[in-house]
Interface confidence: low
Amino acid sequence: SITGISPITESLASLSTYNDQSITFALEDESYEIYVEDLKKDKKKDKVLLSYYESQHPSSESGDGVDGKMLMVTLSPTKDFWLQANNKEHSVELHKCEKPLPDQAFFVLHNRSFNCVSFECKTDPGVFIGVKDNHLALIKVDYSENLGSENILFKLSE
């Protein structure tokens, strides 16, 4: 359960991979596509609104957070659209939705011991947003080796 419906804080940041590729969003045929690409230096990075929520219960058994509390985030690159986990297709998609947001839009935020974070599906513990063949996908990770998978590490920059 998420403590309170309102986020405890929000921030606007651009999202890039461990290898410094940018996560970009493009409107195509009335739907948003998500790309992982090398940006030319002069091109502006897309920003994502991260809304942080506090949850009282760990989403998976792997390495409990401090006092069992965790931060959950939702990611919105543009008004009314949120990143969502599609566990059946192992995909990450952008969907237009109204609040209250569905569980698929919530991700447990893992602060990693680099300048990186990871996003674990609230609905599927042990499954993370990751990079696969130059697009975002859901990747199952053995969480106990929590620095191991570079493809699930992301950098947030203002």
Epitope: P58, E61, S62, G63, V66, S113, S144
Partner: antibody
Framework: EVQLLESGGGLVQPGGSLRLSCAAS????????MHWVRQAPGKGLEWVSS????????YYADSVKGRFTISRDNSKNTLYLQMNSLRAEDTAVYYC????????????WGQGTLVTVSS | QSVLTQPPSASGTPGQRVTISCSGS????????VSWYQQLPGTAPKLLIY???MRRLGVPDRFSGSKSGTSASLAISGLRSEDEADYYC???????????FGGGTKLTVL
């Protein structure tokens, strides 16, 4: 009760060796990154080394690289620090600490064990 | 010398508000979460604040943390005699691939 208990400290001569142990209880040890942190008498905290849950990822402070070796035995719920070529400046209280993996914060600390390097 | 810079000492009278600063760089505080620890004389450090501004369960709300750019701070309001201790900040440093602590601040309650 979640607990970390260090042992193995003592007096050792410069150039000597010592092996510290940290026994964990009350939590699933095999799921956590573990760290050693030390504190010289009257000084601040200094991070020494860390090891991932399955020993795949190991990091050391420059000051101990090549002399100290961190290891763990998940079947025994125990963390180790093998200290070789000890110097006077290694004299300190050595703490083992658990990294709360979702937080990058040391949420559980042992009580510490004193290592004195002196002739 | 510590990578993160803290004032060596701070003081205040009971009831006062005291702030302890922790200054770093873009490779540590600028990019990573900061945590704060309290160490009472003769005891192991104790976690107070994690993820830069999240108070650990059981820690009085008199303690609060914040982060801006490459600096972080710990604020203690309604100072009490039992707050007299050493306080340390902590972060991961990307360039060093190491944990870095501040040098510690000795808080005296006058």
């Amino acid at each position: 009760e979640v607990q970390l208990l260090e042992s193995g400290g003592g007096l050792v001569q410069p150039g000597g060796s010592l092996r510290l142990s940290c026994a964990a209880s009350g939590f699933t040890f095999s799921r956590y990154y573990m760290h050693w942190v030390r504190q010289a008498p009257g000084k601040g905290l200094e991070w020494v080394s860390s090891i991932s849950a399955r020993s795949s990822y190991i990091y050391y402070a420059d000051s101990v690289k090549g002399r100290f070796t961190i290891s763990r035995d998940n079947s025994k719920n125990t963390l180790y620090l093998q200290m070789n070529s000890l110097r006077a400046e290694d004299t300190a209280v050595y703490y083992c600490a658990r990294l709360a993996t979702r937080r990058d914060a040391f949420d559980i600390w042992g009580q510490g064990t004193l290592v004195t390097v002196s002739s | 010398q510590s990578v993160l810079t803290q004032p060596p000492s701070a003081s205040g009278t009971p009831g006062q508000r005291v702030t302890i600063s922790c200054s770093g760089s873009s490779s540590n505080i600028g990019r990573n979460a900061v945590s704060w620890y309290q160490q009472l004389p003769g005891t192991a450090p104790k976690l107070l604040i994690y993820a830069s501004n999240m108070r650990r369960l059981g820690v009085p709300d008199r303690f609060s943390g914040s982060k801006s750019g490459t600096s972080a701070s710990l604020a203690i309001s309604g100072l009490r005699s039992e707050d007299e201790a050493d306080y340390y900040c902590w972060a991961w440093d990307d360039s060093q691939k190491a944990v870095v602590f501040g040098g510690g601040t000795k808080l005296t309650v006058l």
